[in-house]
Interface confidence: medium
């Protein structure tokens, strides 16, 4: 399951609640074509990797989160453990997304 993040507080709470689990954040926008393309795959990964927390941030709805996380283009995937960013890449690349999850989980 992918949790939609709607505020900076909700984002911080989700990172805190994750504990030792890997958190994968998809920064996207409704107008972004590549974001739409990879969205179903991102959701399928949330089913495949039940021990990983998947979050979705709409950069227009949560500009403060996107700004704090220094997101410059979409989609951007960021990876967190214990509240710390441990990885990041931009682009709708399915293989790299799953490979990075496997490396960090």
């Amino acid at each position: 399951m992918v949790k939609q993040i709607e505020s900076k507080t909700a984002f911080q709470e989700a990172l805190d609640a994750a504990g030792d689990k890997l958190v994968v954040v998809d920064f996207s926008a409704t107008w972004c074509g590549p974001c739409k393309m990879i969205k179903p795959f991102f959701h399928s990964l949330s089913e495949k990797y039940s021990n990983v927390i998947f979050l979705e941030v709409d950069v227009d709805d949560c500009q403060d989160v996107a700004s704090e996380c220094e997101v410059k283009c979409m989609p951007t995937f960021q990876f967190f453990k214990k509240g710390q960013k441990v990885g990041e890449f931009s682009g709708a690349n399915k293989e790299k997304l799953e490979a990075t999850i496997n490396e960090l989980v």
């Epitope: 495949k48 990797y49 890449f89 682009g91 690349n93 399915k94 293989e95 790299k96 799953e98 490979a99 496997n102 490396e103 960090l104 989980v105």
Partner: antibody
Framework: EVQLQQSGAELVKPGASVKLSCTAS????????MHWVKQRPEQGLEWIGR????????KYDPKFQGKATITADTSSNTAYLQLSSLTSEDTAVYYC??????????WGQGTSVTVSS | QIVLTQSPAIMSASPGEKVTMTCSAS?????MYWYQQKPGTSPKRWIY???KLASGVPARFSGSGSGTSYSLTISTMEAEDAATYYC????????FGAGTKLELK
């Protein structure tokens, strides 16, 4: 069509170094991780390590740390494996590979390295 | 690092016979991958995500398992199936099993 073209066979002396290349076509190496795998004669497959060519970030099996160095040149779409202080134990076929999670993944044809005086 | 133990190391089967080989992981893994290799050629992806057949793999092949125990089965052996099969896991540090060499009896 995705292809990985590896450099030719090498005959090298003990103690020397060798640098193998793997040139990709049909995709941009910046979009994925490039892996290297070792196979000694009549033996199994051993993962050496991988590189994320987009940022040069590498990861190695601890067994190959210090022995292998993986680099990439995105302008030529090529990944490299350098092996140092060669011994007879390094005599093997070395494969570059695009190890994917989907149905397809891709391997180079392999480069044979023979260490002999 | 996760160690994969394959058994048997070598086996032989007659055409039409059912073949099963196993791969045991030293720790729990989510998914197993299998490769087929014939002498003088590069390994070929054979099974991915534990049970999905790679493109062009005959339907007589199947994969199963979970946790630490996985297997590859050929329902009816054919001459072209003679090869070495390697199991492979894609955790933080990928590893391969030592292989099962399948010979034609």
């Amino acid at each position: 069509e995705v292809q990985l073209q590896q450099s030719g066979a090498e005959l090298v002396k003990p103690g020397a170094s060798v640098k193998l290349s793997c040139t990709a076509s049909g995709f941009n190496i910046k979009d994925t991780f490039m892996h290297w795998v070792k196979q000694r004669p009549e033996q199994g497959l051993e993962w050496i390590g991988r590189i994320d060519p987009a940022n040069g970030n590498t990861k190695y099996d601890p067994k190959f740390q210090g022995k292998a160095t993986i680099t990439a040149d995105t302008s030529s779409n090529t990944a490299y494996l350098q092996l140092s202080s060669l011994t007879s134990e390094d005599t093997a076929v070395y494969y570059c590979a695009l190890l994917q999670y989907s149905a397809m993944d891709y391997w180079g044809q392999g480069t044979s390295v023979t260490v002999s005086s | 690092q996760i160690v994969l133990t394959q058994s048997p190391a070598i086996m032989s089967a007659s055409p039409g016979e059912k073949v099963t080989m196993t791969c045991s992981a030293s720790s729990r893994i989510s998914y197993m991958y299998w490769y087929q290799q014939k002498p003088g050629t590069s390994p070929k992806r054979w099974i991915y995500d534990t049970s999905k057949l790679a493109s062009g793999v005959p339907a007589r092949f199947s994969g199963s398992g979970s946790g630490t125990s996985y297997s590859l089965t050929i329902s009816t052996m054919e001459a072209e199936d003679a090869a070495t099969y390697y199991c492979h896991q894609r955790s933080s540090y990928p590893t391969f099993g030592a292989g099962t060499k399948l010979e034609l009896k």
